[in-house]
Interface confidence: low
């Protein structure tokens, strides 16, 4: 029988009446165009909805937008378009919501062609009030908030000027011209690239990288011959053109660009690219594209300096620059990432790592599933997950994989079971242990979301027909109840719940269509009465993460420590609550060689855990540049994996070698940098 329909499934008592009392419909007085929704702040209940409608006329497009506000998680909305003087808001800029709980919102208005500059509407009270401000420039990008101070904004103009505001958009100052890309760093620092000879495109590979730490009073050039730059964790990366040819290499800085080291990564040619897949304060996952239009490359993982890289995964699927990759950080369990590889026969397979890229394996076949037609052996196959690439290929996949940090261990994804990803209609699978084991959760494609830190999972069938039924589960997807939320089916467009998965409210968005008109409608369902009591001690059970062999003393050790979590029992129907804090008890593991990566100039032979010197480098100068200066690099061949907390046990001591090196690329060295003040 299908999941959720077998005899053991207990019903949630009186749920229809409980949900009916907590279902709130709102019909928007709009012609159907596009709708965008933003949450303002954390746990505030404030939602902004912007509806826009375009009427293409013969010579121009007439546009109309409306702004609505809810302060009860979407149960009721108020039309607040008059607060923005009934102005048409540009949807391509979206709603710029301030960081944390600043309550700040910036909307960018459409202005007539001849105007001197753009116009924004600003709110700093969670969209209760807006102030209209005319800009001295036309914005090219959405306003970007400084992560440290939400009063500081930056924007690029259509003329490539870099504009900064220090008073939340009230006054603007152009701090630099000819800017291609600008980003906030830490401590209100701004990094940006500039061109000298005409345009960003023309100067690609000859750009300069600048930094200002005082919002444009003074500047420092921290790099030349720049192709692009990026920030990840505590690392600043720049791809830099080589002196002699058209190749470029990654350089990395951990001190905001004062000093640079050449990353020990392959150089790339004109048609190739680098991409930071994930980064934190410990390490970086870097994708390096293969030469030629292969659609794949190699994932490398860095050491704690961002300099030394270990090959992590070959044939990693990544279509083109800015294209599609399935790389997914499973946020519900430390160290877990899922991605796709392109195999030799051009089929796509899913791989998973549980140790931050150290080893990759196929996903275990779900116990309640059969191998599909892609499987050569009907008894041996694995689960393959649909993510961004499948969605881009217009497969019947409405959603990417979902995990939430506070719903420990839970991963939900569309997938197929075989030797590779199938183009057949997928089903929905769930893992409750961070990806080690999987179960088919729902038949066919669905939209899904997690509420109350995993206490409730909600799903809606993906269908071209109008729908009026929502499914929910209180036991991590084992059993499902269905609830008819309206008599009149709607054309479903999306599920919305507050980011962070702490809420117990879900909004179902769609439109109704009648003979002459169609209107936006939302139904917000509050599940608080389904989970009618607060969870108590008896509702939780202790769970050891990454446990694969309970007999093993080191069971659960990943990156040098194991973690026990307190998790809600599947049988408990109760509220974790909005103040639920995921709590875990770590214990340190003994070190083994697996807790170390091989340092520069060393490698691990296959099926061996010891690091040995690379034969081709014996007696040679290494093409390696540390902080751009001539100095000896000393190593014992091993370096602890970033974030690894092991203690005691194996301590791999080797004879210390002097690795002489030459700096083949010294244009990011300190003496080549200069400063200037405004």
């Amino acid at each position: 029988s299908a999941p959720g329909e077998d005899e053991e499934c207990g019903r949630v008592r009186d749920f229809v009446a409980k949900l009916a009392n907590n279902t709130h419909q709102h019909v928007f007085d709009d012609l159907r165009g596009s709708v965008s929704l933003s949450w303002v702040g954390d746990s505030t209940g404030v939602i902004l909805v912007l509806t826009t409608f375009h009427v293409p006329l013969v010579i121009m497009t007439f546009g109309q937008s409306k702004l609505y506000r809810s302060e009860d998680y979407g149960k009721n909305f108020k039309d607040i378009t008059d607060l923005i003087n009934n102005t048409f808001i540009r949807t391509e800029f979206g709603m710029a919501i301030g960081p944390e709980n600043s309550g700040k919102v910036v909307l960018t208005a459409e202005v007539s062609g001849g105007s001197r500059g753009g116009r924004i509407f600003r709110s700093s009270d969670f969209a209760k009030n807006f102030v209209q401000t005319d800009l001295p420039f036309h914005p090219l990008t959405q306003m970007m908030y400084s992560p440290q101070n939400s009063d500081y904004l930056l924007a690029l103009s259509t003329e490539n000027g870099l504009w900064v505001s220090k008073n939340f958009g009230g006054k603007w100052e152009e701090i630099h011209k000819a800017v291609c890309l600008a980003k906030w760093g830490s401590d209100n620092t701004i990094f940006f690239t500039t061109y000298a000879n005409g345009s960003c495109k023309a100067d690609l590979g000859a750009l300069e990288l600048w930094r200002t730490s005082d919002l444009g009073k003074s500047f420092k050039t921290i790099g030349v011959k720049i192709y692009s730059f990026g920030l990840g964790g505590r690392f600043l990366f720049a791809s830099v053109m080589a002196d002699k040819d058209t190749t470029r290499r990654i350089h990395v800085s951990t001190d905001q660009g004062d000093t640079w080291s050449m990353a020990q990564l392959p150089s790339v040619g004109q048609e190739q690219f680098y991409s930071i897949l994930a980064a934190n304060d410990d390490m970086v996952f870097m994708h390096v594209d293969e030469p030629g239009d292969t659609g794949f490359g190699t994932i490398f993982t860095s050491d704690d300096r961002g300099i030394v890289y270990s090959k992590s995964l070959d044939r990693h699927l990544y279509t083109t620059t800015g294209g599609e990759t399935d790389f997914t950080n499973v946020t519900s369990l430390r160290g877990v990432y899922i991605t796709s590889v392109l195999s030799e026969d051009n089929s796509i397979q899913t791989m998973i790592t549980f140790d931050q890229g150290g080893r990759w394996t196929h996903l275990r076949k779900p116990e309640n599933s059969e191998c599909d037609a892609t499987a050569k052996n009907k008894n041996e196959c694995s689960l393959h997950i649909h993510a961004s690439y499948s969605i881009s290929q217009k497969l019947n996949v409405p959603m990417a994989p979902l995990s939430e940090p506070n719903a420990v261990g839970i991963v939900i994804a569309h997938g197929s079971v075989g030797d590779a990803i199938s183009v057949m209609v997928p089903d929905v699978y769930i893992s409750d242990d961070g990806g080690y084991s999987w179960t088919k959760m729902l038949e066919g494609p669905h939209y899904y979301t997690i509420l109350d830190s995993g206490g409730i999972i909600v799903a809606i069938e993906h269908s071209s027909r109008p729908i009026n039924v929502i499914k929910f589960s209180t036991d991590e997807g084992q059993c499902w109840q269905t609830y008819t939320f309206t008599r009149d089916p709607i054309y479903f467009t999306g599920l919305a719940s507050e980011p962070g998965a702490r809420s117990m409210n879900i909004s179902i968005w769609g439109f109704t269509e009648s003979f002459l008109t169609s209107q936006w409608v939302s139904y917000t369902i509050d599940f608080k009465d389904i989970l009618e009591r607060n969870c108590e001690e008896k509702d939780y059970t202790i769970w050891l993460a990454h446990s694969t062999d309970p007999e093993d003393y080191e069971d659960g050790c990943i990156l040098g420590y194991k973690e026990q979590f307190l998790r809600l029992r599947k049988s408990s129907v109760c509220q974790n609550g909005r103040d639920y804090v995921v709590t875990k008890q770590p214990s340190i593991c003994l070190c083994s060689l697996e807790d170390f990566l091989c340092d520069f100039g060393y490698y691990r032979p296959e099926n061996d855990s010891k690091c040995v010197e690379q034969p081709e480098l014996k007696g040679h100068d290494l093409e390696f540049c540390l902080y751009g200066r001539e100095e000896h690099l000393t190593t014992n061949g091993y370096r602890k994996i970033p974030g690894d907390k092991c203690q005691g046990g194996v301590n791999p001591v080797r004879e210390v070698k002097d690795l002489k090196k030459k700096c083949t690329s010294n244009f990011l060295s300190p003496e080549k940098q200069n400063s200037k003040s405004n």
Epitope: E100, N101, D579
Partner: antibody
């Protein structure tokens, strides 16, 4: 019902140590963190740290690092807080307070002991 | 650590009147905030947790609101037994920190 019963008042000289006990009943002692909070006369509340009665693991506020030791005896469901190198400004009422279920460290305190007055005076 | 600031330090109210106490956090604590009542010679008593959820056995006249950095405890109609000192406490991050307290006294 949940009860936390603390040891009696103490008078100590500066430089000495004091050990306050907190006996728990009415619930599974090893299932919940035990926190210690103090309150100087006429002042507010100050968190000192917690002990996990299950593992014996502790977490102390920075201010008390090196001076405080929290222990437990699971056989008699009792938690202890020892403060050494006492100074006159350590004069306060010391409370034990039950936190959330095991592993949920950051918590509010639903159950409190009656308090133990420790007076430090020469 | 997160600093919790309560205001006013003292609030003089007549029985039957409404009392509004404020608590501000130096950075966002989401809704991880608790309120306690303490009477002379007694241990604190939990009133509200999660910014707005009443603890078991707490009368409905006590209500909490707010999230992020600004919080309010409201006592809708003061009874004689409500005159006490009230503390807020954040439990978003370790160490848990308390406000300095608001003394509610009879006017």
């Amino acid at each position: 019902q949940v009860q936390l019963v603390q040891s009696g008042a103490e008078v100590k000289k500066p430089g000495a140590s004091v050990k306050v006990s907190c006996k728990a009943s009415g619930y599974t002692f090893t299932g919940y963190y035990m926190h210690w909070v103090r309150q100087a006369p006429g002042q507010g509340l100050e968190w000192m740290g917690w002990i996990n009665p299950n593992s014996g693991g502790t977490n102390y506020a920075q201010k008390f690092q090196g001076r405080v030791t929290m222990t437990r005896d699971t056989s008699i469901s009792t938690a202890y807080m020892e403060l050494s190198r006492l100074r006159s400004d350590d004069t306060a009422v010391y409370y034990c307070a039950r936190g959330g279920p095991q592993l949920r460290v950051a918590e509010y305190f639903q159950h409190w002991g009656q308090g133990t007055l420790v007076t430090v005076s020469s | 650590e997160i600093v919790m600031t309560q205001s006013p330090a003292t609030l003089s109210v007549s029985p039957g009147e409404r009392a509004t106490l404020s608590c501000r956090a130096s950075q966002s604590v989401s809704s991880n905030l608790a309120w306690y009542q303490q009477k002379p010679g007694q241990a604190p008593r939990l009133l509200i947790y999660g910014a707005s959820t009443r603890a078991t056995g707490i009368p409905a006249r006590f209500s909490g609101s707010g999230s992020g950095t600004e919080f309010t405890l409201t006592i809708s109609s003061l009874q004689s037994e409500d005159f006490a000192v009230y503390y807020c406490q954040q439990f978003r991050v370790l160490p848990p920190t308390f406000g300095g307290g608001t003394k509610v006294e009879i006017k």
